[in-house]
């Protein structure tokens, strides 16, 4: 057969679906690889062909679209399972072709099982809510296209294993779940179960997402440098190890890049000849505020090093700050026999 543009196995789109639930999977060619959509391709005389490779097999085989009750079907650029079975797991390929053109891509589909509390190996999307904000909503995800707008599904929301009923600050509103004045105790996994009828059958869609309550931009401040500060002086003798921690607190800010760096005499440590090492550690509070510590270390400090300017810098979307460390050379303790004796007028 003639050459086909093979986009390979698109592992970026690791599709996971629940067993015994409907699943609609769009051919990724039109979403991510080609510059035209299915309608354009179809009107140009191109045909979309589906096939698959079962889990732990190498053999590509056609998809059986003649199963009872049309369990697997294709509609335009969508492959439908009504419903999925565990052994539908495998790599699926959609190929667009005519006599002169061919393009195909494969993607993995995993059918996963869930327990009665909705626990499963499914990778869960994370939705961040700001602490203490008035009203914030999450929406039952990925249910578009499963039923027409004329169908009114029933939606039940759960937190973990528990149906959300009479929760003080969490209110189910159809496809939405509203959080009033969110607290950290609202952290957790939330599941919507959408039930709808189709051709005399009842189907369920289960969607779980993780809610993480984070610091509010209302409370966000520019970076705060806790160390170095004016109360600590780094007094060293030549030959000793110099260790200066730079500890910076960053308020949580959505999509903010938090940065901490040292300068020595106004230059980055990489740009100078001193043998300096910098080790960084990061910790997070429960609301994802961040504390970064960068420890500047000079193993054997020289008297020249002790005259340099060591400045800790920090930057976030809220601003930039800097603080110099107080570094000085330790004055050697006087040796009694010479210095003190002279001081007392001995000759």
């Amino acid at each position: 057969s003639e050459r086909c543009d093979d986009w390979g196995l698109d592992t970026m789109r690791q599709i996971q679906v629940f067993e015994d639930e409907p699943a609609r999977i769009k051919c990724p060619l039109f979403e991510h690889f080609l510059k035209f959509n299915y309608s354009t391709a179809h009107s140009a005389g191109l045909t979309l062909i589906w096939y698959w490779t079962r889990q732990d097999r190498d053999l590509e085989e056609p998809i059986n679209f003649r199963l009872p009750e049309n369990r697997i079907s294709k509609e335009k650029d969508v492959l439908w399972f009504r419903p999925t079975l565990l052994n539908d797991t495998g790599n699926y390929t959609c190929m667009l072709r005519n006599t002169t053109y061919c393009s195909k891509v494969a993607f993995p589909l995993e059918v996963v099982q869930k327990d009665s509390c909705f626990n499963s190996p499914m990778k869960l999307p994370v939705h961040k809510l700001y602490i203490e904000y008035g009203i914030q909503r999450i929406t039952c995800p990925n249910v578009d296209g499963y039923f027409p707008s004329s169908v009114k599904p029933t939606i039940t929301w759960y937190m973990g294993c528990y149906k959300i009923q009479n929760f003080n600050n969490v209110i189910p509103e159809g496809m939405n779940l509203s959080f009033l004045i969110a607290l950290i105790s609202n952290n957790g996994n939330y599941t919507c179960v959408v039930t709808y009828p189709e051709n005399g059958r009842t189907f369920h869609l289960t969607r779980t997402l993780t809610v993480k309550v984070v610091g509010s931009p209302k409370n966000a401040v520019p970076p705060v440098i806790h160390s170095p500060n004016d109360h600590v002086v780094y007094e060293k003798e030549p030959g000793e190890e110099l260790l200066i921690p730079c500890t910076v607190y960053f308020s949580f800010l959505m999509d903010s890049r938090n940065e901490v760096w040292w300068t020595i005499d106004g230059k980055k440590p990489d740009d100078i000849t001193i043998d300096v090492t910098i080790n960084e550690s990061i910790s997070h509070s429960r609301t994802e505020d961040e504390t970064r510590t960068q420890i500047l270390s000079i193993k054997k400090v020289t008297s020249e090093d002790l005259k340099r300017s060591y400045v800790c810098h920090a930057r976030s979307a809220k601003g930039e700050v800097a603080k110099a460390a107080k570094v000085k050379q330790k004055v050697p303790a006087p040796r009694y026999t010479v210095e003190l004796a002279c001081g007392f007028g001995a000759t």
Epitope: E132, G134, I181
Partner: antibody, heavy 118, light 107 residues
């Protein structure tokens, strides 16, 4: 200096209404969640209602749900509690309190007494 | 809702002595627990938040400890102005709930 000053309390008959106000000073009200907490004579403290800094989110104790409405006017630095269908068991000193999740109720007003009696 | 239980209901202590007040939550409230002091005819005053952090201006003789469901407020050496009612309060879950209070009286 942070100050909260309640007003609007008084004697009201069962089934009647009252509107409490809490004037805030010394801090921007718009930055804080606010609450009403009450204390029946000789009894302990009971949280009544809370409102988010922007006024969008409101929460109520079951005992007052559907009867009381919390609101705020940040431009006037004032918090309100509209109390309808009052009952004898609503008799209490009503305090307004500022809250942050991290520090709970860090400042309280001096309270205003609401007496529901015929 | 989370039920907060304080013990004892009344604590009789001599000035200069140590007072230990207990508070138990019906389920875990993490460290989201506050202690308040209330004197007759006055509003409550925040003493401790985050189970162990003293509020601004609170003397060092007041200390809080615990996490989860068991909490303690300790007054290391009672002063005359410390005789009052003390309330614990959880702010982990809505509705925020208070204990019934412990009255610390002069022995």
């Amino acid at each position: 200096e942070v100050q909260l000053l309640e007003s609007g309390g008084g004697l009201v008959q069962p089934g009647g209404s009252l509107r409490l106000s809490c004037a805030a000073s010394g801090f921007p009200l718009s930055n804080y969640g606010m609450s009403w907490v009450r204390q029946a004579p000789g009894k302990g403290l009971e949280w009544v209602s809370a409102i988010s800094y922007d006024g969008e989110g409101t929460l109520y104790a079951d005992s007052v749900k559907g009867r009381f409405t919390i609101s705020r006017d940040n431009s006037k630095n004032t918090l309100y509690l509209q109390m309808n269908s009052l009952r004898a068991e609503d008799t209490a000193v009503y305090y307004c309190a500022r809250f942050r999740y991290y520090t709970a109720f860090d400042y309280w007003g001096q309270g205003t007494l609401v007496t529901v009696s015929s | 809702e989370i039920v907060m239980t304080q013990s004892p209901a009344t604590l009789s202590v001599s000035p200069g002595e140590r007072a230990t007040l207990s508070c138990r939550a019906s389920q875990s409230v993490s460290s989201n627990l506050a202690w308040y002091q209330q004197k007759p005819g006055q509003a409550p005053r925040l003493l401790i938040y985050g189970a162990s952090t003293r509020a601004t201006g609170i003397p060092a003789r007041f200390s809080g400890s615990g996490s989860g469901t068991e909490f303690t407020l300790t007054i290391s050496s009672l002063q005359s102005e410390d005789f009052a009612v003390y309330y614990c309060q959880q702010y982990n879950n809505w509705p925020w709930t208070f204990g019934q209070g412990t009255k610390v009286e002069i022995k």
